[in-house]
């Protein structure tokens, strides 16, 4: 595999990671796939410092992150441990609210207008943030 040593055009470097901030919206799964096509992932927030950095760039706008509980427990898309990791939920969240009338609960996490996190319906078209780590060998599978 090849190593990424600098960020792609239009991506922002911060603490040895590259970030890309959308300006339009997609459903969570489509945002996730967008990042994967970029050999990246939806942003995984591992510290208060990273939270502040992302919050500064997205402003007061609902924005998807790489955290979901579509298969039961809350999971970060890159495998970062949720239970022991950084969290920044709004009070009373996540609540898996069913009262929205869209069917099902709320399985995908997003930054709210004040930066704290909320769970919401994954089909909502929110902005999103992609992240990829520098100096990490990309997974280039062998040809069969």
């Amino acid at each position: 595999g090849s190593e990424r040593t600098c960020c792609p055009v239009n991506w922002v470097e911060h603490e040895r990671s590259c970030y890309w901030f959308s300006r339009s919206g997609k459903a969570w799964a489509d945002a996730d796939n967008y990042c994967r096509l970029e050999d990246a992932h939806l942003v995984v927030v591992t510290s208060w410092e990273e939270q502040k950095f992302v919050q500064h760039h997205i402003g007061p706008v609902n924005t998807w992150m790489g955290l979901h509980d579509q298969n039961g427990p809350w999971k970060w898309v890159d495998g970062t441990d949720y239970e022991t990791g950084f969290k920044n939920w709004r009070p009373e969240q996540p609540d898996d609210w069913y009262g929205h009338g869209l069917g099902g609960g709320e399985d995908c996490a997003h930054f709210t207008d004040d930066g704290r996190w909320n769970d919401d319906v994954c089909q909502r078209p929110y902005r999103w943030v992609c992240e990829t780590e520098l100096d990490k060998a990309s997974q280039e599978p062998p040809l069969l």
């Epitope: 595999g1 090849s2 792609p8 239009n10 959308s22 300006r23 339009s24 919206g25 997609k26 459903a27 489509d30 945002a31 796939n33 967008y34 994967r36 096509l37 970029e38 050999d39 078209p125 990309s138 997974q139 280039e140 599978p141």
Partner: antibody, heavy 121, light 108 residues
Framework: EVQLLESGGGLVQPGGSLRLSCAAS????????MNWVRQAPGKGLEWVSA????????FYADSVKGRFTISRDNSKNTLYLQMNSLRAEDTAVYYC??????????????WGQGTMVTVSS | DIQMTQSPSSLSASVGDRVTITCRAS??????LNWYQQKPGKAPKLLIY???SLQSGVPSRFSGSGSGTDFTLTISSLQPEDFATYYC??????????FGQGTKLEIK
């Protein structure tokens, strides 16, 4: 000049296999996701498969999932589509297409000339 | 899955005419809409992305508009080389980008 050139099409019996290739030139191949799109005779366009620049992430249309495999060799600037368990309904011109990114928006900005795959006994 | 429906399926027009082709999505796709031109025996060519942005090298007589579910492609003054089939494509559901069935533009 930016260019994509497909090869590997032909006549194959139902249940058979075929491997298509797409040779890229004129751009940094490894930096771009790539797609396969097909067009049955006299019909419209159908997205088939996509792969990220490194090859680490792949995606398929439901109609080909489990039968087709997309891959790439960035050292050879080449994209592949391995097609197994072929059916009559897979008969089509197969195009490779580069994913162009324009801010939030994505489109297929460069296409190959296509290669014809015919599945018939 | 998002379904894309174009109308009309075919139309006849003359050189110099103003032509409009419409595309409707089965759900809101915001502005994630592309237009392609395809001539017989050739690969499709990208004309417009993001509903209204003209791809580099495409003549300014082509324009796109719309958002949500309803979109249009307009050719302000048809030229002989514009007779072709036109496809819309949604790019909302990455990467499963579905196409409309096509609109064949023929010479009257």
């Amino acid at each position: 000049e930016v260019q994509l050139l497909e090869s590997g099409g032909g006549l194959v019996q139902p249940g058979g296999s075929l491997r298509l290739s797409c040779a890229a030139s004129g751009f940094t191949f490894s930096s771009y996701a790539m797609n396969w799109v097909r067009q049955a005779p006299g019909k419209g366009l159908e997205w088939v498969s996509a792969i990220s620049g490194s090859g680490g992430n792949t995606f398929y249309a439901d109609s080909v999932k489990g039968r087709f495999t997309i891959s790439r060799d960035n050292s050879k600037n080449t994209l592949y589509l391995q097609m197994n368990s072929l059916r009559a309904e897979d008969t089509a011109v197969y195009y490779c297409a580069k994913r162009g990114v324009y801010g939030d928006y994505e489109a297929f900005d460069i296409w190959g000339q296509g290669t014809m795959v015919t599945v018939s006994s | 899955d998002i379904q894309m429906t174009q109308s009309p399926s075919s139309l006849s027009a003359s050189v110099g005419d103003r032509v409009t082709i419409t595309c409707r999505a089965s759900q809101s796709i915001i502005s994630y809409l592309n237009w392609y031109q395809q001539k017989p025996g050739k690969a499709p060519k990208l004309l417009i992305y993001g509903a209204s942005s003209l791809q580099s090298g495409v003549p300014s007589r082509f324009s796109g508009s719309g958002s949500g579910t309803d979109f249009t492609l307009t050719i302000s003054s048809l030229q002989p080389e514009d007779f072709a089939t036109y496809y819309c494509q949604q790019s909302y559901s990455t990467p499963m980008f579905s196409f409309g069935q096509g609109t064949k533009l023929e010479i009257k």
